[in-house]
């Protein structure tokens, strides 16, 4: 039975040319986190394997930095970065937990961070 919940940074916005940290946190489960995948609309951004460390997809190596923690830092943002991002927690023995973050990259200097919310 999957009892865990993922808390994410929720709906966030950032300025074009800036950077943003995408973060998820898995709680309420004793399952072992074996790997976390970060995806952008079915495109792999990065893998963080609990034992083996980070792998950043070649096409994102110049703009994606691992961390902090299991999170991901996106740099040199463009309006094309607007969209859904997913953190996929592979756990044992529970299975897979998915968190969703929506990022809006704004042309203007007014970029407000959204509230946190939980995904069961």
């Amino acid at each position: 039975m999957m009892t865990g919940t993922i808390e994410t940074t929720g709906n966030i916005s950032a300025e074009k040319g800036g950077s943003i940290i995408l973060q998820c946190h898995l709680s309420s489960t004793t399952a072992q986190v074996t790997q976390v995948n970060w995806e952008q609309q079915d495109q792999l951004l990065a893998i963080c394997n609990a034992d083996l460390g980070w792998h950043i997809s070649p096409s994102f190596k110049d703009r994606v930095a691992p961390g902090p923690g299991l999170g991901l830092t996106l740099q040199s943002l463009t309006v094309n970065d607007t969209g859904e991002y997913f953190c996929i927690y592979h756990t044992y023995p529970d299975g897979t937990y998915t968190g969703r973050i929506f990022l809006e990259v704004l042309e203007s200097s007014v970029a407000e961070h959204g509230a946190r919310f939980q995904i069961p």
Epitope: Q35, D42, L44, I47, I88, H90, T96, T98
Partner: nanobody, 122 residues
Framework: EVQLVESGGGLVQAGGSLRLSCAAS????????MGWFRQAPGKEREGISL????????YYADSVKGRFTISADNAKNTVYLQMNSLKPEDTAVYYC???????????????WGQGTQVTVSS
């Protein structure tokens, strides 16, 4: 859904070698990575090696670095783990795992094989 079948485990003396195979079938068009984990009695499942599909990067746990080698034969949809200079502490059940995209945002994206026992005697 992805199915994984491991083979190649067995009993070997310390200092010996084994090659594990993991054959993947099913929805394997867009696997991100495949890897090997192991679990010794009373211990957590430990990731020991990973190979990625985007650029073939390979990663190893410190405990096996220089002794184990992961490789892939894409034509056969198979991943191998060549294990040399085996030690008694390598004794464990070895599992293959594959990681793919979060299609439909539900279901299992971390497929596990059934495991193969490796026993290293001193």
């Amino acid at each position: 859904e992805v199915q994984l079948v491991e083979s190649g485990g067995g009993l070997v003396q310390a200092g010996g070698s084994l090659r594990l195979s993991c054959a993947a079938s099913g929805n394997i068009d867009r696997l991100y990575a495949m890897g090997w984990f192991r679990q010794a009695p009373g211990k957590e499942r430990e990731g020991i090696s990973l190979i990625t599909s985007d650029d073939g990067s390979t990663y190893y746990a410190d405990s096996v670095k220089g002794r184990f080698t992961i490789s892939a034969d894409n034509a056969k949809n198979t991943v191998y783990l060549q294990m040399n200079s085996l030690k008694p502490e390598d004794t464990a059940v070895y599992y293959c795992a594959s990681s793919g995209p979060a299609d439909a945002r539900n279901g299992e994206r971390w497929a596990w094989g059934q495991g193969t026992q490796v026993t290293v005697s001193s």
